[in-house]
Amino acid sequence: IAPSRPWALMEQYEVVLPWRLPGPRVRRALPSHLGLHPERVSYVLGATGHNFTLHLRKNRDLLGSGYTETYTAANGSEVTEQPRGQDHCFYQGHVEGYPDSAASLSTCAGLRGFFQVGSDLHLIEPLDEGGEGGRHAVYQAEHLLQTAGTCGVSDDSLGSLLGPRTAAVFRPRPGDSLPSRETRYVELYVVVDNAEFQMLGSEAAVRHRVLEVVNHVDKLYQKLNFRVVLVGLEIWNSQDRFHVSPDPSVTLENLLTWQARQRTRRHLHDNVQLITGVDFTGTTVGFARVSAMCSHSSGAVNQDHSKNPVGVACTMAHEMGHNLGMDHDENVQGCRCQERFEAGRCIMAGSIGSSFPRMFSDCSQAYLESFLERPQSVCLANAPDLSHLVGGPVCGNLFVERGEQCDCGPPEDCRNRCCNSTTCQLAEGAQCAHGTCCQECKVKPAGELCRPKKDMCDLEEFCDGRHPECPEDAFQENGTPCSGGYCYNGACPTLAQQCQAFWGPGGQAAEESCFSYDILPGCKASRYRADMCGVLQCKGGQQPLGRAICIVDVCHALTTEDGTAYEPVPEGTRCGPEKVCWKGRCQDLHVYRSSNCSAQCHNHGVCNHKQECHCHAGWAPPHCAKLLTEVHAASGSLP
């Protein structure tokens, strides 16, 4: 049902000139590679007789750290790359003075997206090349010239999967209250077919539209305490990898078959969504597998049916809703959609009508919560690895990151007078804000104990008078005797201790004879071994949950489910007097020491596990030959 190309136009719109509010002058210079697009930005738009102030924040959860893009190179080979350090221009936020408002916009070339005020959904897009201050059209979805689109998921296919549908299931909650559970994350992989690529004309245009779509989908799902994170984008710029049929059910089947074949070499994701430029038969614009999220059939197909990306975003949100176990609203007796205007439909309405929906009904929320009770939904609990998200450091998250001197949490929580919570810079006159060697905003004097000795394999640490952090935790020299064993990197590993760690308090090391052979895959005893440094053999205690065991006589070894690998005796475990397991063999203690390290410490320190001098209080590394006070005096006292 897609309108004929080029894109259909708006029937009725208002011309506005957005005005960007000056941002706060933050007292820190961040590196230029953080990009051109600010962390936060505000715009004033005069539309429908009102001045709307939009407060926006960059959606830093839009792309997962391992985000990849796959396309076909000029020579015909398939290329997958991980774009690094790219800035982006996709924002989310709210409208000032409207409690239940929402906004999702891109600012890449002018403003494009939507903002919702009460029951009105306003779409905005640039009319010319004038950038963010140029002429923009603001209009309502019903004024976009388009035909109603429907979802291809039939009532028959839903019935058996969703169970009985009665109003009793649904206990309405206030429209704006979030489910009081942990946030769930959908790690999304998007495939763009060749028809869509041809329609948009370039990889850059496809990337921009997909990020815009996913930004909108994410905003719609935030009301359900969900985040949608794009982990991969595949653009079929040369040819389709499977037949994209005008029959959406055939295309979905082909997508899922293709995905099953690709899973091993493509991103591990929770959900795959195809965006196609093919016009599906009839009025259908989307089709999905119901309750398939986290399974091999977790996916849907979406026709890009509207000029505005909000259109396909609503379709994707709807089809993803089916993947999450939701039924069409009209199939559920007593289902309440909180939309207040006449034609108001929620996201899971079977047909999107002439206006884009912006919220989920009470029954969609109830279906979702019931889906989340299934064990299969576990894939949604893991947050994507957010270690390299686009967008740089966050002031207010308790992590001192690039460009920050301190971080005491969000301004509303910060109680640290040494740190300015809005700039993450030290307060006037403060030397430090955090650390065990920081007191009253000043660095503690050298020699003050900052980390006491925990056990016989540990060493105590002292402030050095220069840094607010306690020096790195160091341990007794490897090979130092400890209870029943020898210290190794701060631990005192013994067979008994390892068996207790796996099998609980009743676990003990098995008889010595159990260690006298190796085990081959399939629990077969094999060749004789002369020491106790092979497979960890225990007896007694409780079998560890989720682990298979290999029993040979009275010897219990832990194995993987397929029986191909065994829990080894760890490095450093005592295997005899003055002997330790090292590289899988029982060896002499001197494997730990290359020389008499402690002799280099001038009687003012001892050797640590790294074969470095660990100085007594007040003495300076590396050889404990000078007092810290002398060293500081010579180099100028403080940081």
Partner: nanobody
Framework: EVQLVESGGESVQVGGSVRLSCAAS????????MGWFRRAPGKERELLAA??????HYADSATGRFTISRDNAKNMVYLQMNSLKTEDTAVYYC???????????????????WGQGTQVTVSS
């Protein structure tokens, strides 16, 4: 699979000390703000302390008596509790929240992983 496993809960006398440990697995530990919460009988679950790197935050009820720390090398977070009172009797939970999430540290919905809890009983 992500797991947070608390340990160290025990029964102690008023004025005693307890050190709770939380072992994290299956997540990029250094990317998470770790928090300790507790639920006392008949009360709501409340935040006690949170830690990033190297910063910490304490709720009023924990300031002065409790110390939160972490060991990124071992994927561990600890809560040292001193001068315990009978009102400290509760189930103590460890939780993790992405360092990239925003908003108050007290918003429990932002913590995406939770442990099963460990019981601490303080008697007179």
């Amino acid at each position: 699979e992500v797991q947070l496993v608390e340990s160290g809960g025990e029964s102690v006398q008023v004025g005693g000390s307890v050190r709770l440990s939380c072992a994290a697995s299956g997540l990029t530990f250094s990317n998470f703000i770790m928090g300790w919460f507790r639920r006392a009988p008949g009360k709501e679950r409340e935040l006690l302390a949170a830690i990033g790197d190297p910063s910490t935050h304490y709720a009023d009820s924990a300031t002065g008596r409790f110390t939160i720390s972490r060991d990124n090398a071992k994927n561990m977070v600890y809560l040292q509790m001193n001068s315990l009172k009978t009102e400290d009797t509760a189930v103590y939970y460890c939780a993790a929240r992405s360092r990239y999430s925003t908003g108050t540290l007290y918003d429990q919905t932002k913590y995406i992983y939770w442990g099963q809890g460990t019981q601490v009983t303080v008697s007179s």
